[in-house]
C-alpha cells in the first residue's frame, strides 16, 4: 500500500491508522495516496514543520487523545484538500497564528478537550469554508470581538465547557448561517441584548448550566427558526413576558433547575411544535389562569419539585393534548374541582408528596382516560364517594402514606379498594392512621366495626356510583421499577441529573409505567 509504517495499519481504502503509546512522532513514510489519517492514543507531544508534506491528497486528519502540547505554525502545510481536522483530546494551551493557513477546503475543525486559554481573530481568519468549529472543553475565559467574523459559512459552533464569564453582543454578528450554538457549562451570568440577533438561521441554542440570572426581553426575537432552547440549571428568577413570543418552531425548551418564582399568563407564546415542557426544580409558588394556554400540542408537563401551593382553576386551559402531568413534591393543600377539567387526554397524573387534605368529588370528572394516579404521601383522610368509578382504564393508583381515618365513613372507599386491589400495586398498601386502635392496619382488610364511628359527615361532592365489574378487561398493577426510593423531601439531594440511577426515576418524573411514551 505504497509503504505503510510498521506502527500503523493501512487499508485499501487509503485509510491509515496509527495508534499506541510507543509512537512518539508522526510515523514515516506515510502512503502518498492516504485520504484519511488517524493518529490516536500515542505519546506524540509536538508536531513539527510539515510532517504531512507528502500526503497532499489527505481529506481527513484525526490527531486525538495524544500528549500533544506544541504545534509548529507550518505543521499542516500542503494539506489544501483537507476537509476534516481534529486535534481533540490533547494538551494544547496555545494555537500558533497561521496554523490553519492554506487549509482552504477545511470544513470541520475540532479543538475540543484541550487546555486552550484564548483564541484570537487571526486564528480562524483563513478558514472561510469552515462549517463546524468545536472548542468545547477548554479553558477559554473570553471570546474577543472578531474571533469568528470570517467564518460566514459556519453552521455549528460549540463553546461549551469553558470558563466564559461574559459574551460580547458582537461576537456572533456575522454568523448568519449558524444553526447550532452551544454555550453550556460556562460561567455566564447574563447575555447582552442583541447577542443572537444576527443568528437568523439558528436552530439550537444551548445555554444550560451557566449562572444566567436574567433574560433580556428581546433576546430571542430574531431567532424565528429556533427549534431547541436549553436554559436549564441557571439562576433565572423571572421570565420577561415576551421572551418566548416569537419562537414558533420551538420543539424543545428546558427550564428546570432555575429560580423561577412565577409564570405569567401566556408566557409561552404560540409554540405549536412543543410537546414536552420540563419545569421541575424551580421555586414556582402558584399557577395563574391560562399560563400554558398557547401550548396546545403539549403532551408532557413536568412541574414537580417546586413550591406550588395554589393552582388557579384555569391554569391548564388549552392543554387539550396533555397526557402526563407531574405535580409531585409541591405544597398543594387543596385543588379546585375544575382544575383538570380541560385535560381530556390526560393518562397519568402524579400528585404525590404534597399536603392534600381532601379532593373534590369531581376532580377527575372529565379525565376519563386516566391510567395512573399518584396520591401517596399526602394528608388525605378519606376520598369522596365514586371519585374513581368512571375511570375504566385506571390501572395504577397509589394511596399509601396518607393518614386514612378508618371510621364508618371509610367504608365506601374500603369496598372500592377491595374490588380494585390489583390497581393499588403490591409494594405498599394504604394503612389506617386513626382511630388509634386500628393505626397501622391495612385499609383494605380493616374491620370497620371495631373502629370509632364517624361523628361528622364531610360535605364533598359525590358521583352516582358506577359499579366496577371484575369481568371487564383487567388492568394489572403496573408500578414503577423497584421504586423503593420514593421522594419524600421537597428537593432530592443530587448534584447532576445525568447521574441519577434508574431506580430513582420517579423523583423527577414521578410518572409510572402505565403508558408507553
Amino acid at each position: 500500500y505504497h509503504g505503510c509504517p510498521s506502527e500503523c495499519t493501512c487499508s485499501r481504502a487509503s485509510q491509515v491508522e496509527c495508534t499506541g503509546a510507543r509512537i512518539v512522532a508522526v510515523p514515516t513514510p506515510l502512503p502518498w495516496n492516504a485520504m484519511s489519517l488517524q493518529i490516536l492514543n500515542t505519546h506524540i507531544t509536538e508536531l513539527n514543520e510539515s510532517p504531512f508534506l507528502n500526503i497532499s491528497a489527505l481529506i481527513a486528519l484525526r490527531i486525538e487523545k495524544n500528549e500533544l502540547s506544541r504545534i509548529t505554525p507550518g505543521a499542516f502545510r500542503n494539506l489544501g484538500s483537507l476537509r476534516y481536522l481534529s486535534l481533540a483530546n490533547n494538551k494544547l494551551q496555545v494555537l500558533p497564528i497561521g496554523l490553519f493557513q492554506g487549509l482552504d477546503s477545511l470544513e470541520s475543525l475540532l479543538l475540543s478537550s484541550n487546555q486552550l486559554l484564548q483564541i484570537q481573530p487571526a486564528h480562524f481568519s483563513q478558514c472561510s469554508n469552515l462549517k463546524e468549529l468545536q472548542l468545547h472543553g477548554n479553558h477559554l475565559e473570553y471570546i474577543p470581538d472578531g474571533a469568528f467574523d470570517h467564518l460566514v459559512g459556519l453552521t455549528k459552533l460549540n463553546l461549551g465547557k469553558n470558563s466564559l464569564t461574559h459574551i460580547s453582543p458582537r461576537v456572533f454578528q456575522h454568523l448568519g448561517n449558524l444553526q447550532v450554538l452551544r454555550l453550556y457549562e460556562n460561567r455566564l451570568t447574563d447575555i447582552p441584548m442583541g447577542t443572537f440577533d444576527g443568528l437568523v438561521n439558528l436552530q439550537e441554542l444551548a445555554l444550560q448550566q451557566n449562572q444566567i440570572g436574567l433574560l433580556s426581553p428581546g433576546l430571542f426575537h430574531n431567532n424565528h427558526n429556533l427549534q431547541r432552547l436549553y436554559l436549564s440549571n441557571n439562576h433565572i428568577s423571572q421570565l420577561p413576558p415576551s421572551v418566548f413570543m416569537q419562537l414558533p418552531q420551538l420543539n424543545r425548551l428546558t427550564l428546570f433547575g432555575n429560580s423561577l418564582k412565577e409564570l405569567s399568563p401566556g408566557i409561552f407564546g404560540p409554540m405549536p411544535n412543543l410537546r414536552e415542557l420540563w419545569l421541575y426544580d424551580n421555586h414556582i409558588s402558584s399557577l395563574p389562569d391560562n399560563v400554558f394556554s398557547n401550548l396546545r400540542q403539549l403532551q408532557v408537563l413536568i412541574l414537580s419539585r417546586n413550591q406550588i401551593s395554589f393552582i388557579s382553576p384555569g391554569a391548564f386551559n388549552g392543554l387539550t393534548e396533555l397526557r402526563e402531568l407531574s405535580l409531585h413534591t409541591n405544597a398543594l393543600q387543596d385543588l379546585d374541582g375544575n382544575v383538570f377539567r380541560m385535560l381530556a387526554n390526560l393518562q397519568n397524573i402524579s400528585l404525590q408528596n404534597n399536603r392534600l387534605r381532601q379532593l373534590p368529588g369531581n376532580i377527575f370528572a372529565n379525565v376519563n382516560g386516566l391510567m395512573a394516579i399518584q396520591l401517596q404521601n399526602n394528608q388525605l383522610e378519606n376520598l369522596p364517594l365514586g371519585i374513581f368509578d368512571h375511570l375504566g382504564k385506571l390501572c395504577e393508583l397509589r394511596l399509601y402514606d396518607n393518614p386514612w381515618r378508618c371510621d364508618s365513613d371509610i367504608l365506601p372507599l374500603r369496598n372500592w379498594l377491595l374490588l380494585n386491589q390489583p390497581r393499588l400495586g403490591t409494594d405498599t398498601v394504604p394503612v389506617c392512621f386513626s382511630p388509634a386502635n386500628v393505626r397501622g392496619q391495612s385499609l383494605i382488610i380493616i374491620n370497620v366495626n371495631v373502629a370509632v364511628p364517624s361523628v361528622h359527615v364531610p360535605e364533598v361532592p359525590s358521583y352516582p356510583e358506577t359499579p366496577w365489574y371484575p369481568d371487564t378487561p383487567s388492568y394489572p398493577d403496573t408500578t414503577s421499577v423497584s421504586s423503593t426510593t420514593e421522594l419524600t423531601s421537597p428537593v432530592e439531594d443530587y448534584t447532576d441529573l445525568t447521574t441519577i440511577q434508574v431506580t430513582d426515576d420517579r423523583s423527577v418524573w414521578g410518572m409510572t409505567q402505565a403508558q408507553s411514551g
Epitope: 420543539n251 410537546r275 393534548e321 421499577v481 445525568t498 441519577i500 440511577q501 426515576d505
Partner: antibody
Framework: EVQLVQSGAEVKKPGSSVKVSCKAS????????IHWVKQAPGQGLEWIGL????????NYNQKFKGKATLTVDTSTTTAYMEMSSLRSEDTAVYYC????????????WGQGTTVTVSS | DIVLTQSPDSLAVSLGERATINCRAS??????????MHWYQQKPGQPPKLLIK???SLESGVPDRFSGSGSGTDFTLTISSLQAEDVAVYYC????????FGGGTKVEIK
C-alpha cells in the same frame, strides 16, 4: 450522522442473563428517548420499554417488567438493556431506537442484536 | 393493550401500481390534535425504518410515493407507484397507550 450501534450477537444458556449495548453518536444523547424493541424469529415487533437518558427515567411494557432492565451511561452515550432469567422464548433480535419526544415515532434504529437462548 | 390488526397479511402488486395496507386499532388512537399511529418498513436482515409518523406526516428522506391517512381506529399506508426497492414487510405502530405493533404486511412484486 445519527447512528445507533449495538453490541454483537450472544448465545446464552437458560437461566442466565445478557446485557445488550447501544452506542449513540451524531446527536445529543441526553435529549432523546431510547426505546427497546423485540423481534422473535419470524415474528412481529414488540415494545419492551424506554429510557430517558437525561434523568435515567424508564417506562416498561408490563410484560417485560422483571425481565428487562434499561439503563444508560451518559458519559459514553450508551444505553443498555439487561435481560435476566433467560428462556428459549427470549430468543430474538433486540433493537434499540431513538425517539424525539416520549410519544413520537422511533426515527432511527440500531442494527439489532441477536440473542439466542439454548442449552 | 390496544390491538392493531393489519390487512392483508401479504400483498403482491405490479411495479408502478398502487399498494394499499390497512391497520385497524381495537380502540381509537386519535385525539383532536394527533393520531398516534406510525408506519415502518422492514427489509430482510435490516432494522425497521420510519416512513410515516402521526398517521400522515412523511418522515424526511422518505420518497413521496409513500403516504398515510386515517384517524380514530382505521388507518392506511399507500404506496402510489410500487418500486422494486419497496419489497419489504410494513408495520403500523400506535403510541397512544402502551406501544403496540401490527402483525405486519408483506409486500411483493407480482
Amino acid at each position: 450522522e445519527v447512528q445507533l450501534v449495538q453490541s454483537g450477537a450472544e448465545v446464552k444458556k437458560p437461566g442466565s442473563s445478557v446485557k445488550v449495548s447501544c452506542k449513540a453518536s451524531g446527536f445529543t444523547f441526553t435529549d432523546y428517548y431510547i426505546h427497546w424493541v423485540k423481534q422473535a424469529p419470524g415474528q412481529g415487533l414488540e415494545w419492551i420499554g424506554l429510557v430517558y437518558p437525561y434523568i435515567g427515567g424508564t417506562n416498561y411494557n408490563q410484560k417485560f417488567k422483571g425481565k428487562a432492565t434499561l439503563t444508560v451511561d451518559t458519559s459514553t452515550t450508551t444505553a443498555y438493556m439487561e435481560m435476566s432469567s433467560l428462556r428459549s422464548e427470549d430468543t430474538a433480535v433486540y433493537y434499540c431506537a431513538r425517539g424525539d419526544n416520549k410519544y413520537d415515532a422511533m426515527d432511527y434504529w440500531g442494527q439489532g442484536t441477536t440473542v439466542t437462548v439454548s442449552s | 393493550d390496544i390491538v392493531l390488526t393489519q390487512s392483508p397479511d401479504s400483498l403482491a402488486v405490479s411495479l408502478g401500481e398502487r399498494a394499499t395496507i390497512n391497520c385497524r386499532a381495537s380502540q381509537s388512537v386519535s385525539t383532536s390534535s394527533y393520531s398516534y399511529m406510525h408506519w415502518y418498513q422492514q427489509k430482510p436482515g435490516q432494522p425497521p425504518k420510519l416512513l410515516i409518523k402521526y398517521a400522515s406526516s412523511l418522515e424526511s428522506g422518505v420518497p413521496d410515493r409513500f403516504s398515510g391517512s386515517g384517524s380514530g381506529t382505521d388507518f392506511t399506508l399507500t404506496i402510489s407507484s410500487l418500486q422494486a426497492e419497496d419489497v419489504a414487510v410494513y408495520y403500523c405502530e400506535q403510541s397512544h397507550e402502551i406501544r403496540t405493533f401490527g402483525g405486519g404486511t408483506k409486500v411483493e412484486i407480482k
